[in-house]
């Protein structure tokens, strides 16, 4: 097997709980986190399962702004603009990694957290449960 | 903006580029990744804009496996199962954070990276460009 050398070029950790506490470089490629998804596409308006985007802001979290999709209708929009309740608008969810300040208000100490966000909506055929 | 106090209980940072490099506690909340509500839906099959999930694997990244949605059709599926090409299936994209070891093989040093993933597909009315 490969024995990984404790590289002299590696940041050193004095933390007793090492490696539970690590250094993370936030100098991200493509760092503009709060890009409003409305700007990148208008699918949220043109979809047969349209959604509204709600700004979820938390200064104790990185990224501090996350956009949450909320489906506008229970049903799906037909070509004539009316809602078809024989179909369902449902949120598409994605689990994402975020950093949360811990202890709170410490500028350079974070905890890794997983959260579930709704990214947009899609129109699905409902599951019909037949009663025997 | 919020002025974050330099809390005496906070870990100290000697980094000149602070807060570009931060300390992260890896005791993740919701570590139990295998109990993901998102995993249990079959919207990808039941959607009027169904999609297939393709594996994007990178052993030097966490998460090592990310699933990319690829819309099955250019159009959207009608109630009779046929595809309506007057409508478009389009991918809904989301920017997510991933962790990458940097320098490689350093056990306590990571870099946060942003990647754009397609989470699922939605059915939209096409934009019609009229020629003068």
């Amino acid at each position: 097997g490969i024995a990984i050398p404790r590289n002299s070029g590696c940041p050193n950790s004095e933390d007793k709980n090492f490696p539970r506490t690590v250094m993370v470089n936030l100098n991200i490629h493509n760092r503009n986190t709060s890009t409003n998804p409305k700007r990148s596409s208008d699918y949220y308006n043109r979809s047969t399962s349209p959604w509204n985007l709600h700004r979820n802001e938390d200064p104790e979290r990185y990224p501090s702004v996350i956009w949450e999709a909320k489906c506008r209708h229970l049903g799906c929009v037909k070509a004539d603009g009316n809602v078809d309740y024989h179909m369902n608008s449902v949120p598409i969810q994605q689990e994402i990694l975020v950093l949360r300040r811990e202890p709170r208000h410490c500028p350079n100490s974070f905890r890794l957290e997983k959260i579930l966000v709704s990214v947009g909506c899609t129109c699905v055929t409902p599951i019909v449960h037949h009663v025997a | 903006g919020i002025a974050i106090p330099r809390n005496s209980g906070c870990p100290n940072s000697e980094d000149k580029n602070f807060p570009r490099t931060v300390m992260v506690n890896l005791n993740i909340h919701n570590r139990n990744t295998s109990t993901n509500p998102k995993r249990s839906s079959d919207y990808y099959n039941r959607s009027t804009s169904p999609w297939n999930l393709h594996r994007n694997e990178d052993p030097e990244r966490y998460p090592s496996v990310i699933w990319e949605a690829k819309c099955r059709h250019l159009g959207c599926v009608k109630a009779d199962g046929n595809v309506d090409y007057h409508m478009n299936s389009v991918p809904i994209q989301q920017e997510i954070l991933v962790l990458r070891r940097e320098p490689r093989h350093c056990p306590n040093s990571f870099r946060l990276e942003k990647i754009l993933v397609s989470v699922g597909c939605t059915c939209v009315t096409p934009i019609v460009h009229h020629v003068a």
């Epitope: - | 295998s34 109990t35 079959d42 999930l53 990178d58 052993p59 966490y62 998460p63």
Partner: antibody, heavy 117, light 106 residues
């Protein structure tokens, strides 16, 4: 090509503990989890728990909670599974497997643990 | 825990036969279903992941289908090296395996 090489067979007394090792050769652990799966003689497969060596995150099956401890040493690319308070029904082949958190794509050769008085 | 039920528990078939094994989950698991092959004294081998994706290096005679609660593994033309035990496994929740299906020579 990733290979997982496990430690040799063990014979243990009831009430004792066993620690099985799993060494990744031909590559590091990378960012995958390592899961432990056991198989009693003539029986099916049973997942016990997992660890992500990069972070030290562990996740245990309810059934083994409190009795199993999974650890990893990145410097030697080795994962360990320790099972305590052994009983005869723990006699099984114990496998480690590389776990993408979606499937197990590489497996160790297995370690037979026999619990007998 | 999500229970996985395979059927049949064993089957006899001849070389060249088309073989189908089914797996049912006690609740919906989307497509998070894998299939493994295990030969006597050996570790399991991943054949199919995410219900229908063929793992690299696995012959194309193996295919998987299904979504939600019902899944199928098909071997289109059984070869001598395919006689083994086959397991389904879900990863929608903490992993659980089916009880196995033994494919024997007729």
């Amino acid at each position: 090509q990733v290979q997982l090489v496990q430690s040799g067979a063990e014979v243990k007394k009831p009430g004792s503990s066993v620690k099985v090792s799993c060494k990744a050769s031909g590559g590091t652990f990378s960012s995958y989890a390592i899961s432990w799966v056991r198989q009693a003689p003539g029986q099916g497969l049973e997942w016990m728990g997992s660890i992500i060596p990069w972070f030290g995150w562990t996740n245990y099956a309810q059934k083994f909670q409190g009795r199993v401890t999974i650890t990893a040493d990145e410097s030697t690319s080795t994962a360990y599974m320790e099972l305590s308070s052994l009983r005869s029904e723990d006699t099984a082949v114990y496998y480690c497997a590389r776990d993408s958190e979606y499937y197990f794509d590489h497996w160790g050769q297995g370690t037979l643990v026999t619990v007998s008085s | 825990d999500i229970q996985m039920t395979q059927s049949p528990s064993s089957l006899s078939a001849s070389v060249g036969d088309r073989v189908t094994i089914t797996c049912r989950a006690s609740q919906g698991i989307s497509n998070w279903l894998n299939w493994y092959q295990q030969k006597p004294g050996k570790a399991p081998k991943l054949l199919i992941y995410a219900a229908s994706s063929l793992q690299s290096g696995v012959p194309s005679r193996f295919s998987g289908s299904g979504s939600g609660t019902d899944f199928t593994l098909t071997i289109s033309s059984l070869q001598p090296e395919d006689f083994a035990v086959y397991y389904c496994q879900q990863y929608s929740d903490d992993p659980t395996f089916g009880q196995g299906t033994k494919v024997e020579i007729k």
